[in-house]
């Protein structure tokens, strides 16, 4: 079953390469187990950036080596992606799956264009 | 008389606060005197950023204290805005006027969204 997912159109990464955005899914009821996946689309290729399954009311847990962290509140997931470089500029799509209880619901956002600018290197200290 | 003006939808300022974009106007004939104005729209307010009048084939000359510089080639104007800070993020609109010979033509672009990220300060050298 299809589900509406909202996310901001544009986000700027900080000069430290950190970008945060909210992914909100409009469910007709309260799910207990939710899976959130961040996909990156660039040059018509889609790759998975990170994913987490969480029980509503609990923290999102990404893999230890993931570049993503997040928190949830109701149907809103606050996602943070770190370690971004200018070459990572692209469309970051939020995919939400209601895993439990059945039936399964799937929602895919329109994507958040994340712009990343590499900082100028600091001058060497003498 | 109306005239079509094209400019990019989005530009990222460099970490040094410099943003460049091309403003191209589709003139029905060959003008000899052209005026280019950059307007900034933010929070429904429009302010003038800079302006220059130039003779085609010559350099654009902005005022000495202007944050803009530019070059022209045919019907294209290469504009550079410097000294930008994060608070200067906004929609920068290119306005082109064909001043001579008559008739007068006016064209206004859809605007270029310039995103600016302030750099992290470099650590103090001991």
């Amino acid at each position: 079953k299809a589900m509406h997912v909202a996310q901001p159109a544009v986000v700027l990464a900080s000069s430290r390469g950190i970008a945060s955005f909210v992914c909100e899914y409009a469910s007709p009821g309260k799910a207990t187990e939710v899976r959130v996946t961040v996909l990156r689309q660039a040059d018509s290729q889609v790759t998975e950036v990170c994913a987490a399954t969480y029980m509503t009311g609990n923290e999102l847990t990404f893999l230890d080596d993931s570049i993503c962290t997040g928190t949830s509140s109701g149907n809103q997931v606050n996602l943070t992606i770190q370690g971004l470089r200018a070459m990572d500029t692209g469309l970051y799509i939020c995919k939400v799956e209601l895993m439990y209880p059945p039936p399964y619901y799937l929602g895919i956002g329109n994507g958040t264009q994340i712009y990343v600018i590499d900082p100028e290197p600091c001058p060497d200290s003498d | 008389k109306a005239m079509h003006v094209a400019q990019p939808a989005v530009v990222l300022a460099s970490s040094r606060g410099i943003a460049s974009f091309v403003c191209e106007y589709a003139s029905p004939g060959k003008a000899t005197e052209v005026r280019v104005t950059v307007l900034r729209q933010a929070d429904s307010q429009v302010t003038e950023v800079c302006a220059a009048t130039y003779m085609t084939g010559n350099e654009l000359t902005f005022l000495d204290d202007s944050i803009c510089t530019g070059t022209s080639s045919g019907n294209q104007v290469n504009l550079t805005i410097q000294g930008l800070r994060a608070m200067d993020t906004g929609l920068y609109i290119c306005k082109v006027e064909l001043m001579y010979p008559p008739p007068y033509y006016l064209g206004i672009g859809n605007g270029t969204q310039i995103y600016v990220i302030d750099p992290e300060p470099c650590p103090d050298s001991d």
Epitope: P28, A31, P101, P103 | -
Partner: antibody
């Protein structure tokens, strides 16, 4: 298309037990969703009574908890309501409806059946 | 328990008018708000869920908004077929309904 249909006696005597059944077609009640009973006294608003989930677990309105039982017959793809020790205040149109999740919006409803409590 | 206060309890408006109904909850419900239309002798019909999402087939003149404890249901241009009673429902904790708003034509 999912359809729900309530059935049961239209008249129940005070102190007796009200029994209604909701037959579901177009979707298996064990495949998903929660299956609810909602009632509406004449000229008044809607009151959620309780549900049975796809997995057989129940949740009831705390105000009715000691009088209500919702069960199911998976072989007939139907679920039932029993409300004990009824009084005239239980006179209402009784609806069955479906919602997603632990709590949720009711997307499919039965047409309702009027139950009058009177001697 | 979460209490819902729906207002007004009834209203009269002309065809083409903008109609607004509000629903206030006793605590933050995280946008878990639904709106229903009920015509006389019929079962309620789900119009909107999760505060603002229209059910398939529901006309776009119906809309919902809100967050926290304050929610609004709007009919942008009242039509004769919109004569009904409208109910809000929260589904953050239990399923509870507002008292209803009866909409009539002037």
């Amino acid at each position: 298309q999912v359809q729900l249909q309530e059935s049961g006696p239209g008249l129940v005597k005070p102190s007796q037990t009200l029994s209604l059944t909701c037959a579901v077609s177009g979707y298996s009640i064990t495949s998903g969703y929660s299956w609810n009973w909602i009632r509406q006294p004449p000229g008044k608003g809607l009151e959620w009574m309780g549900y049975i989930r796809f997995d057989g677990n129940n949740n009831y309105n705390p105000f009715l908890k000691n009088r209500i039982t919702i069960s199911r017959d998976t072989s007939k793809n139907q679920f039932s309501l029993k409300l004990s020790s009824v009084t005239a205040a239980d006179t209402a149109v009784y609806y069955c409806a479906r919602n997603y999740g632990t709590w949720g919006a009711m997307d499919f409803w039965g047409q309702g059946t009027l139950v009058t409590v009177s001697s | 328990d979460i209490q819902l206060t729906q207002s007004p309890s009834s209203l009269s408006a002309s065809v083409g008018d903008r109609v607004t109904i509000t629903c206030k909850t006793s605590q933050d419900i995280n946008k878990y708000m639904a709106w229903y239309q009920q015509k006389p002798g019929k079962a309620p019909k789900l119009l909107i869920y999760y505060t603002s999402i229209l059910q398939p087939g529901v006309p776009s003149r119906f809309s919902g908004s809100g967050s926290g404890t304050d929610y609004t249901f709007t009919i942008s241009s009242l039509q004769p077929e919109d004569i009904a009673t409208y109910y809000c429902q929260q589904y953050d904790n239990l399923n509870t309904f507002g008292g209803g708003t009866k909409v009539e034509i002037k």
